[in-house]
Interface confidence: medium
C-alpha cells in the first residue's frame, strides 16, 4: 500500500507521459488521477516504468474500479495485464474478440499463464458459447488449447485452425479428442502430396480409423513406433501382418520391444502365428496354425 500524501505543487499530472518516470511511488499515487489513467491506458506501454511504478498504477485502477475494470480499460491494459492476478480477472466481463486478442498478444510466445487461462474462461462465459472466431483466435495463440476442450466443443473447431497445431500441442489430447480432430486434420491437409501429408497428419493419427491406416500402408510412409503405439487399438486390430509391415517399413523391427504393450500385444493375439513368423522378429502369442478364428462380435450381432 502507498501512503496517502498530498501532491506537491505543480506536479499534478495533466496527461500520462514519459515525465512520470521521474515520479516517486508516492508522487504517482498522489499526483496521477485514476480517471485520467483509465482514459490514457494505451500510453502506459510506451513509457519505461519500473515494476514498482506499475504496481502503483495498477493500485490506482483497482481503487477506481473495485468491482472490476470496464472493457474500455481492459482492451488497453497492454503489458499491465501481466500484473493482474486471476482474482482480478475474474471480476472482468470481456466480450470483445479484439480485447481478447490484444491481451493474448501481450503473452505471446509464452506458455498459457493462470491469467490467460482465467481470461479465456471469462471470455467464453461472457460470450455464452465457443464460436468459431473465438476458437480460431485461441488456437492461433495456443494450439495446445485444443486438448483442453471437450469433444463437443472441438466439433466447432474450423479445419483451418489445424494448420497452427504442432505435434507437441496434441500430447495431452485423449483418444476421444483425437477422434474429433483427426477428420478435421484430414480435411485440412487433403490437398498435400503423400509424404508431406503424412508429416502433417502423423500427430493426429490417434483418431484414425482402420481404413485410413490401410490406405497409409500402401504409401511407403515408414511410420515410427511412437506414432504406432498411439493408434487406436480398435483401428489396429483388423490390420494384417503385411499391412503393418508396410505401414512401419524399416521400423517394423521395433514391434519386438513393444510386444507386451497395447496396441501391439492385442494385435499379436489376433494374428496367425505363421504370419507373425514371416516378420522374423520372434513375436509370440499369435493364433496357432490349424485353429479356427471366431469373430465373437459378429456372432453376437447375428444372434
Amino acid at each position: 500500500e502507498v501512503e496517502k500524501t498530498a501532491c506537491p505543487s505543480g506536479k499534478k499530472a495533466r496527461e500520462i507521459d514519459e515525465s512520470l518516470i521521474f515520479y516517486k511511488k508516492w508522487e504517482l499515487e498522489a499526483c496521477v488521477d485514476a480517471a485520467l489513467l483509465a482514459t490514457q491506458m494505451d500510453r502506459v506501454n510506451a513509457i519505461p516504468f519500473t515494476y514498482e511504478q506499475l504496481d502503483v498504477l495498477k493500485h490506482k485502477l483497482d481503487e477506481l474500479y473495485p468491482q472490476g475494470y470496464p472493457e474500455s480499460v481492459i482492451q488497453h491494459l497492454g503489458y499491465l495485464f501481466l500484473k493482474m492476478s486471476p482474482e482480478d480477472i475474474r471480476k472482468w466481463n470481456v466480450t470483445s474478440l479484439e480485447t481478447l486478442k490484444a491481451l493474448l498478444e501481450v503473452n505471446k510466445g509464452h506458455e498459457m499463464s493462470p491469467q490467460v487461462a482465467t481470461l479465456i474462461d471469462r471470455f467464453v462465459k461472457g460470450r455464452g458459447q465457443l464460436d468459431k472466431d473465438t476458437l480460431d483466435t485461441l488456437t492461433a495463440f495456443y494450439p495446445g488449447y485444443l486438448c483442453s476442450l471437450s469433444p463437443e466443443e472441438l466439433s466447432s473447431v474450423p479445419p483451418s485452425s489445424i494448420w497452427a497445431v504442432r505435434p507437441q500441442d496434441l500430447d495431452t489430447c485423449d483418444p476421444r479428442q483425437l477422434d474429433v480432430l483427426y477428420p478435421k486434420a484430414r480435411l485440412a491437409f487433403q490437398n498435400m502430396n503423400g509424404s508431406e501429408y503424412f508429416v502433417k497428419i502423423q500427430s493426429f493419427l490417434g483418431g484414425a480409423p482402420t481404413e485410413d491406416l490401410k490406405a497409409l500402408s500402401q504409401q511407403n510412409v515408414s511410420m515410427d513406433l511412437a506414432t504406432f503405439m498411439k493408434l487406436r487399438t480398435d483401428a489396429v486390430l483388423p490390420l494384417t501382418v503385411a499391412e503393418v509391415q508396410k505401414l512401419l517399413g524399416p521400423h517394423v523391427e521395433g514391434l519386438k520391444a513393444e510386444e507386451r504393450h497395447r496396441p501391439v500385444r492385442d494385435w499379436i493375439l489376433r494374428q496367425r502365428q505363421d504370419d507373425l513368423d514371416t516378420l522374423g522378429l520372434g513375436l509370440q502369442g499369435g493364433i496357432p496354425n490349424g485353429y479356427l478364428v471366431l469373430d465373437l462380435s459378429m456372432q453376437e450381432a447375428l444372434s
Epitope: 514519459e18 506501454n45 510506451a46 513509457i47 519505461p48 501481466l82 500484473k83 505471446k108 510466445g109
Partner: nanobody
Framework: VQLVESGGGLVQPGGSLRLSCAAS????????VAWYRQAPGEQREPVAA???????IYADSVKGRFTISRDNAKNTVYLQMNSLKPEDTAMYSC???????????WGQGTLVTVS
C-alpha cells in the same frame, strides 16, 4: 533477454563518456528504454528515457549535458554524457521495457567515477 552495459570508467570533471547498452533479442525498436543511476548509499534514480515513439526526457540535473539515443539495427541504446560532475559518480544501468511478455530487463550496470 540480456542487457550488457559498457563505456563506464574514471574521468575528470568536465570530461565526457559514452555509455552503451546492448540488448539481445528482437522487437528492440518498439520498446521503451531508459538509463538509471545509483550513487553509493542512494536510491536508484532515472536519468534519461526514450519512449517507444522516440520522444526523450531527462532529469533536471542532467538536462543539456546528457543525451539518450538508440540504434535499432544494433539493438543498442546510448547515453552520451558531457560536462561530467563529481555528483554524476554512480553505477549506471539501462532498463529495457516490454520485450517478449516481460515488463523490464535491467542490466548489471557500468560504473562511472568523476574525480
Amino acid at each position: 533477454v540480456q542487457l550488457v552495459e559498457s563505456g563506464g570508467g574514471l574521468v575528470q570533471p568536465g570530461g565526457s563518456l559514452r555509455l552503451s547498452c546492448a540488448a539481445s533479442g528482437s522487437m528492440f525498436s518498439i520498446n521503451a528504454v531508459a538509463w538509471y543511476r545509483q550513487a553509493p548509499g542512494e536510491q536508484r534514480e532515472p536519468v534519461a528515457a526514450m519512449t517507444s515513439g522516440g520522444s526523450t526526457i531527462y532529469a533536471d540535473s542532467v538536462k543539456g549535458r546528457f543525451t539518450i539515443s538508440r540504434d535499432n539495427a544494433k539493438n543498442t541504446v546510448y547515453l552520451q554524457m558531457n560536462s561530467l560532475k563529481p555528483e554524476d559518480t554512480a553505477m549506471y544501468s539501462c532498463i529495457y521495457c516490454r520485450y517478449d511478455g516481460e515488463f523490464a530487463y535491467w542490466g548489471q550496470g557500468t560504473l562511472v567515477t568523476v574525480s
